[in-house]
């Protein structure tokens, strides 16, 4: 709860220009859902759905809340504390080496594979090889047999929120 | 059940200090922010400020920065408001109150039951 | 500091009818605004937060309404357990600060 951010753990395009930064109220930092004013004197709320702040933090601006894109579901709003909670429609995932976009799971295991792993929204479904038992990581299952799978129930969600 | 539990009436002299206390009850006290309100009779509402008692983080109103000093014991989880150099002016009812469950924003969902000053000469 | 103002000090009424209790802000507070009934020897009560969200348990005759500086409270229909004051307050900004109140009593 008490963990704090300031300016400088901020990625490049939410800190603050070098001239705007301030010093905390000598009392401390602004807590969550709040940012500090330009004159380091008062902390001021986020604004409800729009902003948000996670930490106590000495932040000149809230950040931003995230919108969900198309091909994605809203789990959670954004509130003053927490950004919005974005999840992968049902059939589709986002991978860990493309987490900008919601991928289509695939419909079936390549020749010699079954499926052992539904498609969820943060997985393409898993297949593994009848004889040894490997994984496979390819994309495209053969043509001429595949195993065909629907999609998985959400379990869990996969947020890229802050 | 979240409760706060303040001190009993204080009836002191002006030019002393007093020392209030609300003790919190039903939730993890590091966790949430403790704010004091000032009510006199027949008036309305001020805030005098917040102490978190995570962090130890201070917010006074301005207007109360050399009147009240906020402290706390985390053993007993308990707040403490000091009034010093009383005057007439500090005779009012004083509230301690918690914010919201979901975030930090501050209306009060959760107030003492109030402690009276009464400052006589 | 944002001064709130509510600009009736007392508002008359009659059990029944419908009565909107409104409280201004010196600057735009975001609907960062809570309303709070209090009766004589009580602590406040919150009714309303985010200027129109209702408390848990609150009666579904008090609504909230409004954005930037102006605010409303409104009771759809007055009971007799609904005459006290109530206060407007901001929570956008530190120092938080209330309005002066609004004693609502019955004809």
């Known amino acids: 709860e008490s963990a704090l951010i300031t300016q400088q753990d901020l990625a490049p395009q939410q800190r603050a220009a070098p001239q705007q930064k301030r010093s905390s109220p000598s009392e401390g930092l602004c807590p969550p859902g709040h940012h500090i004013s330009e004159d380091g004197r008062d902390c001021i709320s986020c604004k409800y759905g729009q902003d948000y702040s996670t930490h106590w933090n000495d932040l000149l601006f809230c950040l931003r809340c995230t919108r969900c894109d198309s091909g994605e579901v809203e789990l959670s709003p954004c509130t003053t504390t927490r950004n919005t909670v974005c999840q992968c429609e049902e059939g589709t995932f986002r991978e860990e080496d493309s987490p900008e976009m919601c991928r289509k799971c695939r419909t079936g295991c390549p020749r010699g594979m079954v499926k052992v792993g539904d498609c969820t929204p943060w997985s393409d479904i898993e297949c593994v090889h009848k004889e040894s038992g490997t994984k496979h990581s390819g994309e495209v299952p053969a043509v001429e047999e595949t195993v065909t799978s629907s999609p998985g129930t959400p379990a869990s969600p996969c947020s890229l929120s802050g | 059940k979240v409760q706060l539990q303040q001190s009993g009436a204080e009836l002191v002299k002006t030019g002393t200090s007093v020392k209030l206390s609300c003790k919190a009850s039903g939730y993890t006290f590091t966790e949430y922010i403790i704010h004091w309100v000032k009510q006199r009779s027949g008036q309305g509402l001020e805030w005098i400020g917040w102490f978190y008692p995570g962090s130890g983080s201070i917010k006074y109103n301005e207007k109360f920065k050399d009147k009240a000093t906020l402290t706390a014991d985390k053993s007993s989880s308990t707040v403490y408001m000091e009034l010093s150099r009383l005057t007439s002016e500090d005779s009012a009812v004083y509230f301690c109150?918690?914010?919201?469950?979901?975030?930090?924003?501050?209306?009060?969902?959760?107030w003492g039951q109030g402690t009276l000053v009464t400052v006589s000469a | 500091d944002i001064v709130m103002t509510q600009s009736h000090k007392f508002m008359s009424t009659s059990v029944g009818d419908r009565v909107s209790i409104t409280c201004k802000a010196s600057q735009d507070v975001s609907t960062a605004v809570a309303w709070y009934q209090q009766k004589p020897g009580q602590s406040p009560k919150v009714l309303i937060y985010w200027a129109s969200t209702r408390h848990t348990g609150v009666p579904d005759r008090f609504t909230g309404s409004g954005s930037g500086t102006d605010y409303i409270l409104t009771i759809s229909s007055v009971q007799a357990e609904d005459l006290a004051l109530y206060y407007c307050q901001q929570h956008y900004s530190t120092p938080y600060t209330f309005g002066g109140g609004t004693k609502l009593e019955i004809k």
């Open positions: 109150a918690r914010h919201e469950e979901g975030g930090y924003s501050a209306w009060f969902p959760y």
